[in-house]
C-alpha cells in the first residue's frame, strides 16, 4: 500500500513539474519572440515583457501562435493552392 501511495504521489508531483516546466517553456518562447514579427489583429500588447502578469504572457504567446497558424494557412492557400486549408468562417462578422 505504501508503494501504491508513493506511486500516486510521484505521479501527482510529476504532473505539477510538467505544468511548471511547460509554463516556463512558454515564457521562454515569448521572451525569445517565437512566432515571428508578423503583425496581426487589433490590440497587440507592446508592453515590455517584464511588466506583464503571467496571464498576459500566456495570452500573448497564444496570440503569437494564432498569428503563426493564420499565416501558415494563408501561405498554404496562396502559394500552395491548398484550398482545403482556407479560413471559411462566414458568420463571424
Amino acid at each position: 500500500r505504501r508503494d501504491v501511495a508513493h506511486g500516486i504521489l510521484n505521479e501527482a508531483y510529476r504532473k505539477v513539474l510538467d505544468q511548471l516546466s511547460a509554463g516556463k517553456h512558454l515564457q521562454s518562447l515569448v521572451a525569445r519572440g517565437v512566432g515571428g514579427s508578423l503583425g496581426g489583429g487589433a490590440g497587440d500588447d507592446a508592453e515590455p515583457l517584464s511588466k506583464r502578469h503571467s496571464d498576459g504572457i500566456f495570452t500573448d504567446s497564444y496570440s503569437r501562435y494564432r498569428k503563426q497558424m493564420a499565416v501558415k494557412k494563408y501561405l498554404a492557400a496562396v502559394l500552395g493552392k491548398r484550398y482545403k486549408q482556407r479560413v471559411k468562417n462566414k458568420g463571424r462578422r
Epitope: 515571428g36 508578423l38 493564420a70 501558415k72 502559394l79 482556407r86 479560413v87 471559411k88 462566414k90
Partner: antibody
C-alpha cells in the same frame, strides 16, 4: 479585381485605397495587398482573411490598415511618407490581380 | 525574415533558347511554398508556378520550376518574344508572410 483611390497626397495625409471585387466571395478567399515603387520590385504588405482578421509584414504594421466589406477591401495608409509612393496592387489569393492604383506622396 | 536573392539579372537569350533564373533564400522557405511571377511593364504580376514546381492553369509547359529548401530555379525553354518580362520569386515566410525576390529581367534577342 479593381483598385481605386490612388492620387497625389501630401506627407502625413491619410489615404484609403479601395479594392472592388465582382464575382468573388470574399468569405472564401484571402485578399492580399502588394506594392511596387516606380522602377522597383514587389513588396508584400499584408492580407485579410475570410473572418476579417488582417495580418501585416512587420515593416507595415502600424503604417497600414486592411479592412473589408462584403464586396470591397480597403487599404488605409495611416500617415504617408514619400517612401510610400508606389503602385498598390490588390490580389485575390495571389493568382488574380488588379491593375493597380498609383499613390504619389509629395509636398 | 527571409531574404530572397535572384540571379542573374538581367539575363538574355535568343528565341528558341533556354533561360534559367535562380532564387536563393537566406532561410528555408516554409513548406516549399515558393512561387514565380511574370510581370510586364504597366501590368500586374502573373502567377506562373506555385509550390516550387506546380504549373498554374493556362501557363505554357515551357515554364518549369524546381528546387526545395533554400534553392529554387525557374526554367523557360523554347524562349518566345512574348517571354520578355521581369520574373519574381516569392517565398513563404512565417514571420513575414511573403518575401519577394528582387526580380530578374529576361531579354529575348
Amino acid at each position: 479585381v479593381e483598385e481605386s483611390g490612388g492620387r497625389l497626397v501630401t506627407p502625413g495625409t491619410p489615404l484609403t485605397l479601395t479594392c472592388t471585387v465582382s464575382g468573388i466571395d470574399l468569405n472564401s478567399y484571402y485578399m492580399t495587398w502588394v506594392r511596387q515603387a516606380p522602377g522597383k520590385g514587389l513588396e508584400w504588405i499584408g492580407f485579410i482573411d475570410a473572418g476579417g482578421d488582417a495580418y501585416y509584414a512587420s515593416w507595415a504594421k502600424g503604417r497600414f490598415t486592411i479592412s473589408k466589406t462584403s464586396t470591397t477591401v480597403d487599404l488605409k495608409i495611416t500617415s504617408p511618407t514619400t517612401e510610400d509612393t508606389a503602385t498598390y496592387f490588390c490580389a485575390r489569393d495571389l493568382d488574380l490581380w488588379g491593375q493597380g492604383t498609383l499613390v504619389t506622396v509629395s509636398s | 525574415a527571409a531574404v530572397l536573392t535572384q540571379t542573374p539579372s538581367p539575363v538574355s537569350a535568343a528565341v528558341g533558347g533556354t533561360v534559367t533564373i535562380n532564387c536563393q533564400s537566406s532561410e528555408s522557405v516554409y513548406g516549399n511554398y515558393l512561387a514565380w511571377f511574370q510581370q510586364k511593364p504597366g501590368q500586374p504580376p502573373k502567377l506562373l508556378i506555385y509550390e516550387a514546381s506546380k504549373l498554374e492553369s493556362g501557363v505554357p509547359s515551357r515554364f518549369s520550376g524546381s528546387g526545395s529548401g533554400t534553392q529554387f530555379t525557374l526554367t523557360i525553354s523554347d524562349l518566345q518574344c512574348d517571354d520578355a518580362a521581369t520574373y519574381y520569386c516569392a517565398g513563404g515566410d512565417i514571420s513575414e508572410g511573403v518575401a519577394f525576390g528582387g526580380g530578374t529581367e529576361v531579354v529575348v534577342k
